[in-house]
């Protein structure tokens, strides 16, 4: 009943909770003396489901078969309307619709750690949507008996609050349970376990590592335990890789020892733990330790590459250049580099440490031969040093690889082929790529990169430091010995027209003819590699096409001279700038008359 | 699934009489109360007339009462309303519904809901 009911009452037949699929009857009747006027024909009664209508009758009781009800709960509520009045509410029921209890299955018990409470978990199987009553019985030796209920909506877990002893860790425990509701029961299977079945150790803790005079060879993980534990298992993996490595142990108290962690590198460990070879289960692994190894010194060897550049009569420019080890090379925090300059035949030598660059410049005199060492060093020591002789690296023009081309490859790279040099291909020993900015003026500061490539390479594909829009100067080193041979090429991974053309900044005679000079353009508005500029040039006000000269683009060229202009008239002359993609706007415009006689 | 068929209208002149009748199928028909509602021509849905599960109770909207009479035969599945004394104003599509498609007399057109059948009334 959901009122008081004063007026009348509801009833449900054959009950208030029933299967799906059922049908009911709900009767709605008033009490004496509670209708309308006391005059039954004015009574009309109306059965509600929820807010709605579903039947009516004129009288003192309403009779309702009600079919297809959904599961759940559905709410009845039985009115009386009168003529020239409100609805008044008479009675009501709720009507409970589910399905009887599904056999529990999967059912499993579980002791979190020695000192823990037996606790089981089961599958309740399709909901009953009734309130429905779960009982676990758990029975053990000497007839002892455990029971628990529980009323929750949604039972599936219950705890028994009893400690099951090691004393007698072979002695059988059952557990079943039993779901109960008002349209039927159902147990599940029998689960028989032991101690050691369902006692799962707490995960290990306080773990610790120590790494004995510092060295990452001789490394002990450790760790404490509940006292059952006969077995681990020990998984460990670099903080940066999602594989571990797992590692089993039996007895191991403990501690275990590692051999193969790498140098220098963070390490996330766990641990787990059981107390069975074949019987129960393992525990939850531990909370991470996470510990670095430390450092070991350097392997490898640094890839060196320099450039030579004249400075005067007596002296020449050596820039070095070299590349990080890799971490796993590196085996630790590189502190600084150690560079040595040594003259060969007099023996003298230079050190120096580096320490933040991975390059160096010296001047050194034109004559002797020169060679260089170049090591990287950590806390623990130095890398093998690599050895170079400074050569003159384009001195051999028969070593100079042939044909080289440099073609766009996609987005910022460049393919760079070539074809071996006229000398005996055989004799080179590698191929050296090196490209860098292409920036007039030479200028020296600009970043270097290179490449090593196997003599029988023929081709490159660099895209280190490759931007677009960008002319690289490209050069292929052939070595063979203390010789080496070199070609030079200007390439870039995408291009378009210029946005600017060249600017003149002067016009001056010189024997009739002109030489025209101008300002190169800036390097981030030439847009790739400059191919040509051309000079244009028209008599003013005149509505002719302009003549126009195309000069090759040379990196260091800022001047051409023209003769082809009539004495006494003023021209208008401007220029472009051109790359394979196509042609700039004009730079700007200047006005010139040449003064010379007419022929 | 629950289908409702109705029938029997047609132009008839005033104060003529018709007969509607509806099929009912695809659900326990005695267990449901029954309505007739209609819609004249650019207007709303009107409740006319209802019948409980029974057959014996009617309720009648006051437009109609005294000229309409609702009833309801369970062994067949039908539903009929007697029209008499027709008026202009009774001109709209007849159709028939569940009770619980109405509730206080407002009613929402169901999916199941058939075709209607229409009724003129004109000189």
């Known amino acids: 009943k959901i009122d008081a009911c004063k007026r009348g009452d509801v009833t449900v037949k054959p009950s208030h909770v029933i299967l799906l699929g059922s049908t009911v009857n709900i009767t709605c009747s008033l009490k004496p003396r509670q209708g309308c006027f006391h005059y039954s024909r004015r009574n009309k009664l109306i059965l509600y489901k929820f807010d709605r209508r579903i039947n009516f009758h004129h009288g003192h009781s309403l009779n309702s078969q009600v079919t297809g009800l959904p599961l759940g709960t559905t709410l009845f509520v039985c009115k009386l309307a009168c003529i020239n009045s409100d609805e008044i509410q008479i009675c009501g029921a709720e009507i409970f619709v589910g399905v009887a209890p599904e056999q529990p299955q999967n059912l499993s018990c579980i002791q979190k750690g020695e000192q823990g409470t037996v606790a089981c978990t089961w599958e309740r199987g399709r909901d009953t949507h009734l309130y429905t009553e779960y009982t676990l019985q758990l029975s053990g030796p000497k007839n002892l008996t455990w029971q628990k209920q529980c009323k929750d909506i949604y039972c599936d877990y219950l705890d028994f609050g009893i400690n099951l002893t090691p004393e007698s860790p072979e002695s059988n425990f059952t557990a079943k349970v039993t779901a109960v509701n008002s349209l039927g029961s159902s147990s599940s299977l029998p689960s028989t376990f032991t101690f050691l079945d369902i006692v799962r150790p707490l995960p290990p803790w306080d773990i610790r590592i120590k790494f004995q005079k510092a060295s990452v060879s001789r490394c002990t993980l450790y760790w404490r335990d509940e006292g059952l534990v006969l077995l681990n298992r020990l998984r460990y993996r670099p903080s940066n890789s999602r594989l571990w490595n797992m590692v089993n142990v039996t007895k191991a108290k403990g501690r275990h020892d590692l051999l193969d962690l790498k140098p220098f590198t963070e390490y996330e460990f766990q641990i787990s733990s059981k107390l069975h070879l074949y019987k129960g289960s393992w525990s939850d692994w531990s909370e991470s330790l996470r510990a670095q190894t430390p450092e070991e010194e350097p392997t490898g060897m640094l890839d060196v590459w320099y450039m030579k550049r004249h400075i005067d009569y007596s002296r020449q420019q050596i820039s070095l250049f070299w590349k990080n080890l890799s971490v796993s090379e590196a085996r630790g925090k590189i502190l600084h580099y150690q560079v040595t300059l040594q003259e060969l035949t007099g023996g003298k030598a230079m050190t120096q440490n580096i320490t933040g660059h991975t390059s160096w410049t010296t001047v050194i005199p034109r004559t002797g031969n020169w060679a260089v060492a170049v090591s990287a060093a950590n806390s623990k020591g130095s890398s093998l040093p690599t050895r170079i002789n400074i050569m003159n690296l384009c001195e051999a023009g028969l070593l100079a690889p042939r044909q080289v081309s440099a073609n766009s490859e996609g987005m910022d790279n460049i393919l760079v082929t070539w074809q071996p040099p006229r000398k005996d291909p055989s004799a080179v020993q590698e191929y050296v790529v090196e490209w860098r900015e292409l920036h007039p003026g030479g200028d020296t500061q600009v970043p270097l990169n290179w490449l090593r490539s196997r003599p029988y390479n023929v081709s490159a594909l660099i895209s280190e430091n490759i931007k677009s829009y960008i002319c690289y100067e490209i050069r292929v080193y052939a070595l063979s010995g203390d010789q080496g041979g070199c070609s030079s090429i200007l390439g870039n991974s995408k291009h378009k027209a210029p946005l600017s053309g060249p600017h003149i900044n002067a016009i001056t005679e010189e024997k009739g003819s002109i030489l025209i000079s101008w300002n190169s353009i800036p390097v981030q508005e030439q847009m790739g590699c400059l191919l040509h500029y051309r000079i244009y040039w028209k008599e003013r006000d005149s509505n002719s096409q302009p003549q126009l000269c195309e000069i090759p683009y040379r990196v260091s060229q800022n001047s051409h001279p023209i003769n082809s202009l009539q004495p006494r008239v003023t021209y208008v002359l401007w220029m472009t700038a051109l790359t394979a993609a196509g042609e700039s706007s004009h730079g700007n415009e200047r006005e010139f008359c040449l003064q010379g006689k007419a022929n | 699934q629950v289908q409702l068929q109705e029938s029997g209208g047609g132009l008839v002149q005033p104060g003529g009489s018709l007969r509607l009748s509806c099929a009912a199928s695809g659900f326990t028909f005695s267990t449901y109360a029954m309505s007739w509602v209609r819609q004249a021509p650019g207007k709303g849905l009107e409740w006319v007339s209802a019948v409980n599960s029974g057959g014996l109770s009617t309720d009648y909207a006051d437009s109609v009462e005294g000229r309409f009479t609702i009833s309801r035969d369970d062994a067949k599945n039908m539903l009929f309303l007697q029209m008499n004394r027709l008026k202009p104003e009774d001109t709209a599509r007849y159709y028939c519904?569940?009770?619980?498609?109405?509730?206080?007399?407002?009613?929402?057109?169901?999916?199941?809901w058939g075709q209607g059948t229409q009724v003129t009334v004109s000189s």
């Open positions: 519904a569940k009770y619980e498609d109405c509730s206080d007399y407002v009613c929402d057109r169901a999916g199941y």
